[in-house]
């Protein structure tokens, strides 16, 4: 669902997301600190263009654990 | 209070274009996206693409895609939606509606309607 | 595209009447399902959200019910002025769609 060219909007990004994070938690609008561009939010990065699990990641409330 | 405030009805020839304006307010503008939805005489309602009025990025339906452009001025509040090329079935009432949250939980403010009528 | 079927409609009903309106998507839209209520020359109204959740300022009487594929909209007591079409409205991916309408009537 979020291969290349493709977009996610709505519901669908949420529970993407949701399954993505986990129980890390997400933002919408990822943290200044965190962005190594002009961050736009979610919505403009997945729904209004196409967006990658990588960068779906980039929105987890916290790194995941390396085991 | 929180409103939306649209440009009065249209008599457009086909071919012609329209712009229709909702100015917001009651509320932080830039902070929700905003809907543009249409509703031909008697029929059911039809999503035709949204705005993000903070950075004016778009995302439309495909059925519009070349035909329709939605743009904002956050000096007063306001979201346009032009539509070109119009035809007779381009007839309708079209509305602005405001983005609950995220695109995923509906629209819970509205314009009062714009009727635009093509014809000849 | 998902597309959203409603029934039946219209819908005949009498003052006091417990009305119950259904909307089906054609694929699975988990509880991303809206209810909206129009009156003629009237824009539409916000009723319910997230398939359940009944938004601000609307009576109680209205309420919401269903996951997946098929939803729910129920008046427990019709009162006059509900008497309008209701739209379901999916809001799990774009293009949002909205069901055909359900247009409830005075018997």
């Known amino acids: 669902a979020y291969g290349p060219g493709e977009t996610l909007c709505g519901g669908e990004l949420v529970d993407t997301l949701q399954f993505v994070c986990s129980d890390r938690g997400f933002y919408f609008s990822r943290p200044s600190s965190r962005a190594n561009r002009r961050s736009r939010g979610i919505v403009e990065e997945c729904c209004f263009r196409s967006c990658d699990l990588a960068l779906l990641e980039t929105y987890c409330a916290t790194p995941a654990k390396s085991e | 209070q929180v409103q939306l405030v649209q440009s009065g009805a249209e008599v457009k020839k086909p071919g012609a274009s329209v712009k229709v304006s909702c100015k917001a307010s009651?509320?932080?503008?830039?902070?929700?996206?905003m809907h543009w939805v249409r509703q031909a005489p008697g029929q059911g309602l039809e999503w035709m693409g949204i705005i993000n009025p903070s950075g004016g990025s778009t995302s439309y339906a495909q059925k519009f895609q070349g035909r329709v452009t939605m743009t904002r001025d956050t000096s007063t509040s306001t979201v346009y939606m032009e539509l070109s090329r119009l035809r007779s079935d381009d007839t309708a009432v079209y509305y602005c509606a405001r983005d609950v949250q995220w695109l995923a939980y509906g629209m819970d403010v509205w314009g009062q309607g714009t009727t635009v009528t093509v014809s000849s | 595209d998902i597309q959203m079927t409603q029934s039946p409609s219209p819908l005949s009903a009498s003052v006091g009447d417990r009305v119950t309106i259904t909307c089906r998507a054609s694929?699975?839209?988990?509880?991303?399902l809206n209810w909206y209520q129009q009156k003629p020359g009237k824009a539409p109204k916000l009723l319910i959200y997230?398939?359940?959740s009944l938004q601000s300022g609307v009576p109680s009487r209205f309420s919401g019910s269903g996951s997946g594929t098929d939803f729910t909209l129920t008046i427990s007591s019709l009162q006059p002025e509900d008497f309008a079409t209701y739209y379901c409205?999916?809001?799990?991916?774009?293009?949002?769609?909205f069901g055909g309408g359900t247009k409830v009537e005075i018997k």
């Open positions: 009651g509320y932080t503008f830039t902070s929700y996206y």
């Open positions: 409205q999916q809001s799990y991916s774009t293009p949002l769609t």
């Open positions: 997230a398939a359940s």
């Open positions: 694929q699975s839209i988990s509880s991303y």
